[in-house]
């Protein structure tokens, strides 16, 4: 009685169950009643990451430096190459097929989270008591200077873009 279903890591062909090829190998010939499935290793720069019956291995991803990409993890016969972006850039998608320059936070905004190879800069508005006077991908909002601790008084109020200006206290004569 020929099988109608096969075990895990097997497939049904010509009324018999053949073993799938292990990750890193491709199918050359199905099994017969005399011999097992014939599988061969993927070549240089190729991979297959599952138990399979593929007759061709997949090409490793190319991390194109013209797109700002570099290799984060070299591919093997069982895994694809993982790309990331050059310093100062981040991936435009989860697949990391291209890169864009990290966003800078404008004056009045500070960096809440510094960008990584896969995520952009996250900016936040500087709350009352804090300011940022530069456009930066790294600078957080800075607290206004405390005039009191310097025995000075506020001569000009701070904003989200400027620090307070301190000056000497007026002395009564």
């Amino acid at each position: 009685e020929p099988p109608t279903a096969c075990r895990e890591k097997q497939y049904l062909i010509n009324s018999q169950c053949c073993s799938l090829c292990q990750p890193g190998q491709k199918l050359v010939s199905d099994c017969t009643e005399f011999t097992e499935t014939e599988c061969l290793p993927c070549g240089e720069s190729e991979f297959l990451d599952t138990w399979n019956r593929e007759t061709h291995c997949h090409q490793h991803k190319y991390c194109d430096p013209n797109l700002g990409l570099r290799v984060q993890q070299k591919g093997t016969s069982e895994t694809d190459t993982i790309c990331t972006c050059e310093e100062g850039w981040h991936c435009t998608s989860e697949a990391c097929e291209s890169c864009v320059l990290h966003r800078s936070c404008s004056p009045g905004f500070g960096v809440k989270q510094i960008a990584t190879g896969v995520s952009d800069t996250i900016c936040e508005p500087c709350p009352v008591g804090f300011f940022s006077n530069v456009s930066s991908a790294f600078e957080k909002c800075h607290p206004w200077t405390s005039c009191e601790t310097k025995d000075l008084v506020v001569q000009q109020a701070g904003t989200n873009k400027t620090d307070v200006v301190c000056g000497p206290q007026d002395r009564l004569r």
Partner: antibody, heavy 115, light 111 residues
Framework: QVQLVQSGAEVKKPGSSVKVSCKAS????????ISWVRQAPGQGLEWMGM????????SYAQKFQGRVTMTRDTSTSTVYMELSSLRPEDTAVYYC????????WGQGTLVTVSS | QSALTQPPSASGSPGQSVTISCTGT?????????VSWYQQHPGNAPKLIIY???KRPSGIPDRFSASKSGNTASLTVSGLQADDEADYYC??????????FGGGTKLTVLG
């Protein structure tokens, strides 16, 4: 059980071409590669190349690059091996065989190159 | 010039054992566990007797065994019989969808 049946003997003139066929029966034609091997009189086996019938992709031994062409016809479950610019030293029995492992062989085709 | 090196001849008396070697390189025999052995009687097509270094197709007697160490594969025929007299060839996968053969060994059964 896969069976490979090859075309009959050929006599060719130097400089001409020969096309040998290998018809497969039993099994699924697209599910195994076909290798071609030749054996000159009194000599050993020589791997010439292979074709993957599922996609028609080929791989040839460096010695035969540019002179050998392997093709397939999925409608008739037949693969072909054409060797061009024949020389007397191409006189040999040409075999087709299943896969790289070559667990099933055709009966062989004698190609004689003589003026 | 074959890619794999085999002794041209080997011999043994009935009942004895004979071992045939097949030496390649670190790019073929040494790199992959895809060594096969074939038996060829005069006038016939070769027949697969060992694949993937040491596996026997069903129907091949266990008198035929094989192994591999480094860049050298070996075939042993034990309990020699008259019908074992034939040519024996090894082959190995050599990467990039290429295959290489040995030059062949003529096995003679004495007596």
């Amino acid at each position: 059980q896969v069976q490979l049946v090859q075309s009959g003997a050929e006599v060719k003139k130097p400089g001409s071409s020969v096309k040998v066929s290998c018809k497969a029966s039993g099994g699924t034609f697209s599910s195994y590669a076909i290798s071609w091997v030749r054996q000159a009189p009194g000599q050993g086996l020589e791997w010439m190349g292979m074709i993957n019938p599922s996609g028609g992709t080929t791989s040839y031994a460096q010695k035969f690059q540019g002179r050998v062409t392997m093709t397939r016809d999925t409608s008739t479950s037949t693969v072909y091996m054409e060797l061009s610019s024949l020389r007397p030293e191409d006189t040999a029995v040409y075999y087709c065989a299943r896969g790289f492992r070559m667990d099933q062989w055709g009966q062989g085709t004698l190609v004689t190159v003589s003026s | 010039q074959s890619a794999l090196t085999q002794p041209p001849s080997a011999s043994g008396s009935p009942g004895q054992s004979v071992t045939i070697s097949c030496t390649g390189t670190s790019s073929d025999v040494g790199a992959y566990n895809f060594v096969s052995w074939y038996q060829q009687h005069p006038g016939n097509a070769p027949k697969l007797i060992i694949y993937d270094v040491r596996k026997r197709p069903s129907g091949i007697p266990d008198r035929f065994s094989a192994s591999k160490s480094g860049n050298t594969a070996s075939l042993t025929v034990s309990g020699l019989q008259a019908d074992d007299e034939a040519d024996y060839y090894c082959s190995s996968y050599a990467g990039n969808n290429r295959l290489v053969f040995g030059g062949g060994t003529k096995l003679t059964v004495l007596g």
